[in-house]
């Protein structure tokens, strides 16, 4: 009998609010034995795969997806999924990346550390949940983000 795969988690380093032009790294985590991690974007058809999987702990593996210079187009929700033979896991929750115009003000922090999305209950209608519906980019208060239509 195939094992039940735990849902992956996703986090962002150094955080989920990133100044334009700065770097961000998405960290996807799953159990030991993962062959491929995939990073997907809500409403986008593009994705990234990696088989560069490292062991984060005795029971966890992880993969890192780095964006060297964040632009407005990188804003929006991201999620992870992994392949542990012979099957794919469920998807992680979405993690929203916000891209901030550099204001130069000393009072506002550049990032929000410790942002992550961990496992929650999978929606029951899984046959229609592979990709979230299309969304449009919005600019508000010098933050680039995506508005959800749920």
């Amino acid at each position: 009998q195939e094992e039940d795969l735990p849902r992956p988690s996703i986090s962002a380093e150094p955080g989920t609010v990133i100044p334009l032009g700065s770097h961000v790294t998405f960290v996807c985590r799953g159990p030991v034995g993962v062959q491929t991690f995939r990073l997907e974007r809500e409403s986008r058809s593009t994705y990234n795969d990696t088989e560069d999987v490292s062991q984060a702990s005795p029971s966890e593996s992880e993969a890192r997806f780095r964006i060297d210079s964040v632009s407005e187009g990188n804003a929006g929700p991201y999620r992870c999924i992994y392949y542990k033979p012979p099957k794919w896991s469920e998807q992680s929750d979405y993690l929203e990346l916000l891209v901030k115009e550099t204001s130069g003000g000393p009072d506002s922090p550049d990032t929000e550390p410790g942002s992550s999305a961990g496992p929650t209950q999978r929606p029951s209608d899984n046959s229609h949940n592979e990709h979230a519906p299309a969304s449009q980019g919005l600019k508000a208060e010098h933050l680039y983000h995506h508005h959800h239509h749920h």
Epitope: R44, D49, Y83, K87, A134
Partner: antibody
Framework: EQSVEESGGRLVTPGTPLTLTCTAS????????IQWVRQAPGKGLEYIGA?????YTYYASWAIGRVTISRTSTTVDLKMTSPTTEDTATYFC?????????????WGPGTLVTISS | ELDLTQTPASVSAAVGGTVTIKCQAS??????FGWYQQKPGQSPKLLIY???KLASGVPPRFKGSGSGTEFTLTISDLECADAATYYC?????????????FGGGTEVEIK
């Protein structure tokens, strides 16, 4: 070299179940969506359905109950449960492009299915 | 399920000229959209994916644009080899399943 190839097309009588197979070579099928498309003689392309990398299966509304799509580690099958003469066509399978689900860059040569009494 | 309306059904243009093909979707599909070229007796060939990205090996004379519900394929500096039938396809797999419908095709004749 990466390729997909359809097989199983032949002449059958109406109502005879028929299974077509899409075989992947040179790449890991588990990473990809595979779609089935058909083309009746002299007509346009018609989407039948798809098997996604994560194991979801989608069908065109007209195909629900008429076909079943399933996959193994190296193949994606299209089973025609009770074909009619209107199902006579060349059947193609195709794989989506690396890094983007929106386009299908790898197509097989097609397999001809003829339904006739 | 989504419908794609492709126009025109056929078009004739001279070598060196330009052809524009349009596809209209009945619902928004963002940029989950592709354009294909098919010649008689051959399998379809991907030209454009993501509504505007050029597939590998396709010359930049082929240009895709649009998003949401309106999409356009423009072929410039037409060559004899461009004579073919062109199809658009919705590839959106979402919370609302919108199918993978193709447009009806546009037959391009080169004079």
């Amino acid at each position: 070299e990466q390729s997909v190839e359809e097989s199983g097309g032949r002449l059958v009588t109406p109502g005879t179940p028929l299974t077509l197979t899409c075989t992947a070579s040179g790449f890991s099928l588990y990473k990809y969506n595979i779609q089935w498309v058909r083309q009746a003689p002299g007509k346009g392309l018609e989407y039948i359905g798809a098997s996604t990398y994560a194991g979801y299966t989608y069908y065109a509304s007209w195909a629900i109950g008429r076909v079943t799509i399933s996959r193994t580690s190296t193949t994606v099958d299209l089973k025609m449960t009770s074909p009619t003469t209107e199902d006579t066509a060349t059947y193609f399978c195709a794989r989506h492009i690396d890094g983007d689900y929106s386009g299908y860059a790898l197509w097989g040569p097609g397999t001809l299915v003829t339904i006739s009494s | 399920e989504l419908d794609l309306t492709q126009t025109p059904a056929s078009v004739s243009a001279a070598v060196g000229g330009t052809v524009t093909i349009k596809c209209q979707a009945s619902q928004s599909i963002d940029t989950w959209f592709g354009w294909y070229q098919q010649k008689p007796g051959q399998s379809p060939k991907l030209l454009i994916y993501g509504a505007s990205k050029l597939a590998s090996g396709v010359p930049p004379r082929f240009k895709g644009s649009g998003s949401g519900t309106e999409f356009t394929l423009t072929i410039s500096d037409l060559e004899c080899a461009d004579a073919a039938t062109y199809y658009c396809q919705n590839t959106y797999y979402g919370v609302r399943y919108l199918g993978g419908a193709f447009g009806g095709g546009t037959e391009v004749e080169i004079k």
